[in-house]
């Protein structure tokens, strides 16, 4: 069986390698050729090389989609701007205001409380959290502020904390927390930032933000 | 030495409230997330509701809007205020502790649990 496909391949080989010479003899005005016959196997050969130019235009397009779809890395980004917020609760507050970074759809501020990625990865993750206190207004425990991870299905966890005790300048004194990290999330993942005392934080221009990047 | 301990169980009739307490000793709460499982008659254990050391808290579907869970810091003391009883709430409840840096059920520290059963 493989001798007999051998040999139908040398007899392709054979017709092929006729068919080029024959158009060698055509181009160069061979009198032993008819114009008929030149004009035939010219049209065939032309075509040959249309289907050939066609179908390499396919593939280049094939393979540049390709290219795009393993390229398909946008950036991910986003920074947001604290918004002073009437409500009890500890989790802080974020606004798309002043001078704030949303670099698409693949990043979203929800509830205005919680950032939520849709695609999974390494990300930056940062927050600064300037806060104005004095020790005899404030209870003993120090101002704490939590960066927080809720993943769906999952329990919610603390990624980072920072403390800082209450300042004795009056009326209060300004201090900032700076908390950053690297953390896988999965999509859905949502990330935000806790508070001990919500009352206490600036939110002056540039004084409380929130934000991560896709690396 | 570290430990739960569970307290407020009893009987309730269908549509009643009970409110049971977790006393915690031998460690810092704000450190912890504090949660509460219950295991009824050959059931698996299941949890019902969990608070984070900020005061964040989940709950299982079953129990959203009847039973509430807080906690005291000062008291190291975890709270779930159960109300609108049903007969399917029978169960042993125990406490339980999760370092608050893990997001899943890894709970270091059980208390012995506290029987509540619902019945006419």
């Known amino acids: 069986h493989r001798r007999l496909d051998k040999i139908e391949d040398e007899r392709n080989l054979h017709e092929d390698f006729v068919f080029m010479k024959t158009i060698q003899r055509c181009n160069t005005g061979e009198r032993s050729l008819s114009l008929l016959n030149c004009e035939e196997i010219k049209s065939q050969f032309e075509g040959f090389v249309k289907d050939i130019m066609l179908n390499k235009e396919e593939t280049k397009k094939e393979n540049s989609f390709e290219m795009q779809k393993g390229d398909q890395n946008p950036q991910i980004a986003a920074h947001v701007i604290s918004e002073a917020s009437s409500k009890t609760t500890s989790v802080l507050q974020w606004a798309e205001k002043g001078y704030y970074t949303m670099s698409n759809n693949l990043v979203t501020l929800e509830n205005g409380k919680q950032l939520t990625v849709k695609r999974q990865g390494l990300y930056y993750i940062y927050a600064q959290v300037t806060f104005c206190s004095n020790r005899e207004a404030s209870s003993q425990a120090p101002f704490i502020a939590s960066l927080c991870l809720k993943s769906p299905g999952r329990f919610e966890r603390i990624l980072l904390r920072a403390a800082n005790t209450h300042s004795s300048a009056k009326p209060c004194g300004q201090q900032s927390i700076h908390l950053g990290g690297v953390f896988e999330l999965q999509p859905g993942a949502s990330v935000f930032v806790n508070v001990t005392d919500p009352s206490q934080v600036s939110h002056g221009t540039g004084f409380t933000s929130f934000g991560l990047l896709k690396l | 030495e570290v430990q739960l301990v569970e307290s407020g169980g009893g009987l309730v009739q269908p549509g009643g409230s009970l409110r049971l307490s977790c006393a915690a000793s031998?460690?810092?709460?704000?450190?912890?997330?504090m949660g509460w499982f219950r295991q009824a008659p050959g059931k698996e254990r299941e949890f019902v509701a969990d608070?984070?050391?900020?005061?964040?808290?989940e709950y299982a579907d079953s129990v959203k809007g009847r039973f509430t869970i807080s906690a005291d810091n000062s008291k190291n003391t975890a709270y779930l205020q159960m109300n609108s009883l049903k007969p399917e709430d029978t169960a042993v409840y125990y406490c339980?502790?999760?370092?608050?840096?893990?997001?899943?059920?890894?709970?270091?520290?059980w208390g012995q649990g506290t029987l509540v059963t619902v019945s006419s």
């Open positions: 608070i984070m050391p900020y005061g964040s808290t």
């Open positions: 031998g460690f810092t709460p704000d450190d912890y997330a």
């Open positions: 339980a502790r999760r370092d608050a840096g893990i997001d899943f059920y890894y709970m270091d520290v």
